[in-house]
């Protein structure tokens, strides 16, 4: 904490302008009156204050709104938002995208994840819901910032918004949040034909149930082994050789390549040897040929 | 323009780590494998392991397993390999390498970083 | 594991000259899962050829590959200054994934 001095009369500072980075840290703290420095927060990103001044400034507007920065404050915050903590940022309330893309514009290039993160969260609960605007705002000044929000946000997206959806957009979702927007991209893109869909709902998938997975092998889709892999663990187990097969279609060779990796290996041990032998690609690990399989969880369930 | 930027030189003691990166641009890092090649001075190419930076799932060469730790973040888009226990066998120039996912051949490499192992 | 040995080591030849550089591999390897790569001094490896006999974006056409099981080759029909290089095969289809010795081309 900075320590408490008195400020001298030739310092006393009327407004917020270049010549206080001539000041030292205690000066600052003594000089510059909080409420002045929230009036005239546009002013200060325009100045090339040093970081041990910014958290002087920071240090004011923490005393001077313990309970969380008004957004007329967010919002010019520039520079001045890298110095935020996300505990910080939790007490905000923020509803204005312009303050937003202000920030974001702000965090980039920067180690912000989780100030981001935080940050949108707190836009989305200020507007209520992820509505398309804020759905537009975000992949256009940070794409893959939709999949900071937790499963929870993103309950809140209405499907009509999932066509403004990019696949760089969701490149970060984890299966928790594609399970929550696979159902969602499905009803939205329920009218489309065969291949048009599989192209829309494909960065989707890590968030599909195996009877969906089932029903594109089916279909022709020749999925590549980057979309296979990223299906759910789940998914992909009760595959039967020839549906994977089918879900592939010449891209079935790639099993070979990825045999060791998650979800392709579970697969793989999964099935009989005699079935994988039908591919051809010289998989091993299978269930050998004349070996029952006793699935223990069942009979479990029913003593 | 697809590229793996990789960090500078680097000069370690023996039994020391190293934890290289390998930042990736133009392209989806979630769509292709990370893998990671060794060469010593003059000498050829040694495959030390693969990550799949969707899910962090990693596979590596026996000879380097326990030692080497394949890692991604996928907000910065920068794969990461650390190497532990360093002995002056370690000196050698590593590279990250994109491979898509399915096949077998790395069509962009890395920078390369060196890393001298010496007391 | 299983070992790709590379021959000549190094070599030089003429420009004008139809190279052949070969692959053997210790046991039979798909010929989907075999490339070629190119490397100059002081940079990183390029691309050069993919399972087996496709050209990589960017490669002259005078270059070509070819082989199956356990022998490979690439092939330049006429040699310039600048495929002066060391050429690595690169095997995929076992773990774990390895490469040749290399071989050192240079011009004459």
């Known amino acids: 904490d900075v320590e408490r001095t008195t400020c001298p009369p030739e310092k006393e500072v009327h407004e917020i302008d270049e010549s206080l980075i001539f000041y030292k840290k205690r000066e600052l703290e003594a000089c510059v009156d909080a409420a002045l420095l929230a009036a005239q927060m546009d002013r200060v990103d325009a100045i090339p204050f040093t970081y041990e001044q910014l958290d002087v400034l920071k240090h004011k507007l923490d005393e001077l709104y313990p309970q969380g920065y008004p957004e007329s404050v967010i919002r010019h915050l520039g520079h001045l938002f890298l110095k935020m903590s996300p505990e910080d940022i939790r007490k905000w309330n923020v509803t204005s995208l312009e303050t937003l893309k202000a920030l974001l514009k702000v965090s980039k290039g920067h180690e912000m994840s989780a100030q981001v993160a935080t940050l949108i969260d707190r836009v989305v609960v200020g507007r209520g819901q992820l509505d398309k605007d804020t759905v537009d705002t975000l992949t256009a000044f940070c794409p893959g910032c939709l999949c900071s929000l937790s499963p929870e946000r993103l309950s809140s997206v209405p499907p009509s918004v999932i066509g403004a959806v990019r696949p760089q957009d969701l490149d970060t979702c984890g299966p928790r949040q594609l399970d929550v927007l696979y159902p969602k991209a499905r009803l939205a893109f329920q009218n489309m034909s065969g291949s048009e869909y599989f192209v829309k709902i494909r960065p989707f998938l890590g968030g599909a149930p195996t009877e969906d997975v089932k029903a594109l092998s089916q279909q022709n889709v020749s999925m590549d082994l980057a979309t296979f892999m990223k299906l759910r663990r789940e998914a992909v187990l009760p595959l039967t050789v020839a549906e994977v097969q089918k879900l592939l279609g010449p891209h079935v060779e790639g099993l070979k390549v990825e045999e060791q990796h998650s979800p392709v290996r579970d697969w793989i041990l999964k099935q009989r040897q005699d079935d994988l032998d039908t591919l051809g690609l010289g998989l091993q690990g299978g269930i050998p040929n004349g070996y029952l399989i006793l699935d223990l969880s069942v009979r479990e369930a029913l003593s | 323009e697809v590229q793996l930027q990789q960090s500078g030189p680097e000069l370690v003691k023996p039994g020391a780590s190293v934890k290289i990166p390998c930042k990736a641009s133009?392209?989806?890092?979630?769509?292709?494998?990370m893998d990671w090649v060794k060469q010593s001075r003059g000498k050829s190419l040694e495959w030390i392991g693969d990550?799949?930076?969707?899910?962090?799932?990693?596979i590596y060469n026996q000879k380097f397993e326990g030692r080497a730790t394949l890692t991604v973040d996928k907000y910065s888009s920068t794969a990461y390999m650390e190497l532990r226990g360093l002995t002056s066998e370690d000196t050698a120039v590593y590279f990250c390498?994109?491979?898509?996912?399915?096949?077998?051949?790395?069509?962009?490499w890395g920078t390369g970083t060196t890393v001298t192992v010496s007391s | 594991q299983l070992v790709l040995t590379q021959s000549p080591a190094i070599m030089s030849a003429s420009p004008g000259e139809k190279v052949t550089l070969t692959c053997s591999a210790s046991?039979?390897?798909?010929?989907?899962?075999l490339s070629w790569y190119l490397q100059k001094p002081g940079s990183s490896p390029k691309l050069w050829i993919y399972?087996?006999?496709n050209l990589a974006s960017g490669v002259p056409a005078r270059f070509s590959g070819s082989g199956s099981g356990t022998s490979y080759s690439l092939t330049i029909s006429s040699m310039e200054a600048e495929d002066a290089a060391s050429y690595f095969c690169?095997?995929?289809?076992?773990?774990?994934?390895?490469f040749g010795g290399g071989t050192k081309l240079e011009i004459k």
């Open positions: 990550v799949f930076p969707y899910n962090g799932d990693s």
């Open positions: 133009g392209y989806t890092i979630t769509d292709y494998n």
């Open positions: 399972s087996t006999s």
């Open positions: 390498a994109r491979r898509k996912t399915g096949t077998g051949y790395f069509d962009v």
């Open positions: 690169h095997q995929w289809s076992s773990y774990p994934y390895t």
């Open positions: 046991s039979s390897v798909s010929s989907t899962y």
